[in-house]
Every structure is written in structure tokens, then in C-alpha cells.
Amino acid sequence: AGVFELQIHSFGPGPGPGAPRSPCSARLPCRLFFRVCLKPGLSEEAAESPCALGAALSARGPVYTEQPGAPAPDLPLPDGLLQVPFRDAWPGTFSFIIETWREELGDQIGGPAWSLLARVAGRRRLAAGGPWARDIQRAGAWELRFSYRARCEPPAVGTACTRLCRPRSAPSRCGPGLRPCAPLEDECEAPLVCRAGCSPEHGFCEQPGECRCLEGWTGPLCTVPVSTSSCLSPRGPSSATTGCLVPGPGPCDGNPCANGGSCSETPRSFECTCPRGFYGLRCEVSGVTCADGPCFNGGLCVGGADPDSAYICHCPPGFQGSNCEKRVDRCSLQPCRNGGLCLDLGHALRCRCRAGFAGPRCEHDLDDCAGRACANGGTCVEGGGAHRCSCALGFGGRDCRERADPCAARPCAHGGRCYAHFSGLVCACAPGYMGARCEFPVHPDGASALPAAPPGLRPGDPQRYL
């Protein structure tokens, strides 16, 4: 475990003609902040691992207002470091993206507005515990100067933060084969469990389970002297003791390739294979153009005809990010309508529709009533992907095939008795009640709350519900 630290020194116009306009004005004061995104060395290609090593956001810088007529100076910066903690081993080679953001502080409706001013990216080799490394990167007409380092968090030490330190067991010195932990001289390296059988004299390990050989030794367990395994490919001075040629310094020793380039020997010299955004004999020249293919996942690069003009990436469906490096979960946008199941196939989006719906996004409601008949004079009603029958009086069920019992719901109030009738139901009311459902009490003086009963019907007679 450890922390990657980034110190921004300056952000302002780069050298040469075409100085950029100040990003802030009297009408629109603004302030800067920065974002850093880190990925392990090879993950630049991997869309599924955006900022896999971590990311950090700086504080906001001081508010800046452009002086009319003055060229854009170096802009005021936020205080402090950007710190990206990493939990596992430091990978040694890493990719970074540093973005400079502008926060406009004018009278924006709904709060401040943010816009990306510049973005730089690169790949570097860096050992943890080393000194600050300085860098200058250009993005269009802007120039960013910064330093960075990786440091281990105790008890971890080493170039990859994989060795552990423990307090000394004895006051004077560490145990056999264990070094003091610089800079924690009062602590000792904790022994690592190397690969089983790894030579204790000629091998060592920086991570559990590995076996790395000291100079002059080789083999999976560092038990084979280099002199016996190198006679087939002689190079360099002869060994006086074995009479065999021991490899001398090769053109790739010390890796002459900068910025994470990988070295391969050629008959005359060496050749560097440079990471994206770097070129030159030793990958020492920086500056990304569209011809470098900075857009991942087939993205279209626009602009960036030369190293001093910024490029933008137009991403294929399913990808986003400044370099199309992030895979989008397009199903999270719930594109399938009417309860359809979303399937993101990577190159396309598919919707598996529920019964009764169709179309690329399940947007078409199929004619649910087509070919469906409702019996006994019922009418078909569409909706929700399933047909429904509105049944004629006296019938029920899905297709109106069942004769309904109109008395099942106990429609007669106040103890009235219900009788099924060909045209509906009839309520025989209990004494003291009247009405189609026996809902009205009869007044004690014989008058009812209703208008006079129709001729031929006395209060208390069964009232037929028409």
C-alpha cells in the first residue's frame, strides 16, 4: 500500500505563438481545479479498468479575474498535493491522465458551471520511494508543469511497496539476512516467503512466491551460474575462472527507452517500442496526434493534426471517457420500454420484449385483441400487453364465458336478501329498509327518505334492481 502524490507547479500558456485567451473574465470570474486518473502500465488499452489505480480531485484554486488587455498569465493554483492512495503493489509503470477544469462563478442558474480546459496523458516508469519526478506536458496552447512520486505507507517498503517492515526484535541489529528499513532505521525488513526452493544465497524476492536472481545466477530457483548457461550465446569478456564468456553490458541494459518504452536489441544497437503519445529514438518526444491513435475502442479522433493542437475522441456506442476508455453500461439508462429485458452485447443493444410488445425498444404495443373473442356479448379491451374482456351483465371470467353470480358480492344492505334474476339481482329488504339495495331506512311515521314508492309497491316489498 502507498500513495501517489502529484504536485502541480504551474498551468498557463505554453511557449510559441497563439497564446490562449484567459479562461476567466471580469464578467465571468473563475477558478481552476485538477483531476488525476491513474492506471497500471498496460491498462491503457483496457476499457474495463478506468482509473484502476485510483483517481483524485484537487481543491478549488483561488478565484481569478482576467485583467483586461493582459495576456493569460500562469493561473492561480489550488493549494496542496493531489493524493491517490493505492492498496496493492505499486506497478512501476503507470498511465496517467491529468485534467485541468475551470469552474465559472458567474450568475449561472443552478450553481457554477464546469468545463474542461485541458487534458494531458502519458505513461511513465516510476519506482516507489524514489525522488520527485518533474514533467512538462502540453495540451493545445496550454502548458502544465508538475511533479509526482509514489511513496509506500508503513509498514510497506521497496520499489513496489511489497516488502514489509516490523519493529526490531533486538535493540542493536536486524536478524540474519534482514536489512534495516530506510528511512525507518529502528525497524527491520520482515522476511518474505519466496518461492519454495529459491536459493537463499543467490536468490531473493520482492513479492511472496517469486524468486529473483542476483547477478551471475539464473534458473527458476537461481541455482544455475550464468557462466554455464551463457556459453551458447557468447558476448563480452571471457571469464578467467570458467573460461566461458559471461554476458557483458547489452544495449538494452538500464533500459534506454524513456516514458515506459520497451527495449529490444538489434544487431547494431537497440530499438524502442514506445507507448501511445511518445516517439523518437528513445521515446523521449511527447505529444499526441490523431495519427498516434489515442482513442481507444475504435473511437474517432478529431483535431490533433499536430502535437500542439488538442484532439477529441468521438466514441462508439457503449464507450465514453476522454479517450473512449470507459465502457458504458447502456442498460442502466433503461432503454427497453414496457418492461423489456435489456441485453448489452457490446457492439449492440438488444431488448427482449414481454409478451404483447415488439420493436427494437419494445415500444410497439401489439394488438392484444387480434383474434381474441369475448363470449356472451363482451367487448375486448387492450392494455398492458394482455387483452381483457369487459363482460355483459350477468357474465364474468377472462373471456366472459362464466355466468356471474350477482349475489356473490352481498349487494343488499341492512340484512336484505338477494335473489338472482335474469336481468340482474333483486333485494328483499328487511323491515324498516327500502331501495334497490335496501340502503334507505323507512321513517317511523311511514314516510320514507325517498319519493313515494311507485304504484303497486309498498315499503318493505322487494325492490327490483333495474
Epitope: 488499452e45 475504435g298 473511437g299 474517432l300 479522433c301 462508439p316
Partner: antibody
Framework: EVQLVESGGGLVKPGGSLRLSCAAS????????MNWVRQAPEKGLEWVGQ??????????HYAESVKGRFTISREDSKNTVYLQMNSLKTEDTAVYYC????????WGQGTTVTVSS | NIVLTQSPATLSLSPGERATLSCKAS??????VSWFQQKPGQSPRLLIY???NRYTGIPARFSGSGSGTDFTLTISSLEPEDFAVYYC?????????FGGGTKVEIK
């Protein structure tokens, strides 16, 4: 300057085979998806297939009309992409273009394939 | 596969006139439509991407519009070098497909 140069076209009998090459210069070839697109005489454009990057395990995709007959490969060290065409049919007669990316930004000048008995 | 239908098949116009080309998709393709220009004996060249964005180096007289299923390429004032065949292509769904083309010829 970006240049894509196709070669390998020619006259071949139905059922025969042909291998097309596309050599790229002026770009970091290994960072680009590569496609083959064809155009039958007096007809429109038809995407044939695609090969992605080493980091994508050189994944390939093909149009249904050529699946099982055509194979795309690439040699990043030579900045070259290939189209191996087997079991050729008369309807494969076309000008074949190589093109880059998902959006076909850079195009070659094309090479003509004629399948005829 | 998504089908793109271009109209008209041929457009006869004079230099200086405005050209309006149409492209209809068989289903919603968002704004993932590009326009390509092809002159006789030459390879196609990307003009417009994302339905309305001009590609690097393309003159401002070319503009694109539309989203969903209906797209338009407009050449505001035809130059002699603009007489060519124009294709629309969709990149919403894999595989990419092209329209049949519109030939812009000199009247």
C-alpha cells in the same frame, strides 16, 4: 501523412482464393482497429469485416455474407492487415478498401478483385 | 441489420446551388450517422460524423442534421469539386451499414 495501400487483387475463378494486404504508414498502426469494406461495380459500400487490437486478443468480426470464407489477420510489426478470401463467389467481385477505426476515418485507394470463370 | 434508404438517387444541380440529401434509417440510430463523399475512381472520404459534426479539414459549406431515423446532408453552395456520390452510414448497431448513395451531378 496517413497512407493505406491495398494490394493483392486480381482475377480469380469461383471457388478460388486470394489474399489481400493493406500496408499502413503515418499512423501508430497497432493502436487502430482495421476494417475491410468492399464496393461491387456500380453499387454501394458494404462492410466486410474488422480486426481489433492485441489488447482485444485481435478479435475479429465478419459480415454474414463472408463468414466462414474470409479471414482477417494483422502483423503490427509490419504495419499490415490482411484479408484471406477462400471459396470465392462471383458476387465477391468488388473493389476492396481497408479503413481504420469504428467510424472508417482513413481509407486506402482500394484493390480490385474479379471473380469470374 | 439496419437498412438506410437515401433519396433522391440522383440530384441534378448547378454550381452555387444548395443541395439537400436525405437518409432514412429503418430504426432509431440516435445520432450515430456519418456521411461519406466518393468521387469517380477514388476511395470514400469521411465528411460528417455524429450526424452533425464536420470531420477534420471538411469545408463549412457541408453540414449534417437529424437524429433518430431521419438525417440530412446539406451543401450550402455547390462547388465544382462537390459533384460526387454521397453515402450515409449508420454506426449505432454492429455491423455498420450504408445507404445506396445519392449522386450529385452537374445540371
Amino acid at each position: 501523412e496517413v497512407q493505406l495501400v491495398e494490394s493483392g487483387g486480381g482475377l480469380v475463378k469461383p471457388g478460388g482464393s486470394l489474399r489481400l494486404s493493406c500496408a499502413a504508414s503515418g499512423i501508430t498502426f497497432s493502436n487502430f482497429w482495421m476494417n475491410w469494406v468492399r464496393q461491387a461495380p456500380e453499387k454501394g459500400l458494404e462492410w466486410v469485416g474488422q480486426i481489433r487490437l492485441k489488447s482485444d486478443q485481435y478479435a475479429t468480426h465478419y459480415a454474414e455474407s463472408v463468414k466462414g470464407r474470409f479471414t482477417i489477420s494483422r502483423e503490427d510489426s509490419k504495419n499490415t492487415v490482411y484479408l484471406q478470401m477462400n471459396s470465392l463467389k462471383t458476387e465477391d467481385t468488388a473493389v476492396y478498401y481497408c479503413t481504420t477505426g469504428y467510424y472508417f476515418d482513413y481509407w486506402g485507394q482500394g484493390t480490385t478483385v474479379t471473380v469470374s470463370s | 441489420n439496419i437498412v438506410l434508404t437515401q433519396s433522391p438517387a440522383t440530384l441534378s444541380l448547378s454550381p452555387g446551388e444548395r443541395a439537400t440529401l436525405s437518409c432514412k434509417a429503418s430504426e432509431n440510430v440516435g445520432t450515430y450517422v456519418s456521411w461519406f463523399q466518393q468521387k469517380p475512381g477514388q476511395s470514400p472520404r469521411l465528411l460528417i460524423y455524429g450526424a452533425s459534426n464536420r470531420y477534420t479539414g471538411i469545408p463549412a459549406r457541408f453540414s449534417g442534421s437529424g437524429s433518430g431515423t431521419d438525417f440530412t446532408l446539406t451543401i450550402s453552395s455547390l462547388e465544382p469539386e462537390d459533384f460526387a456520390v454521397y453515402y450515409c452510414g449508420q454506426f449505432y448497431s454492429f455491423p455498420s451499414t450504408f445507404g445506396g448513395g445519392t449522386k450529385v451531378e452537374i445540371k
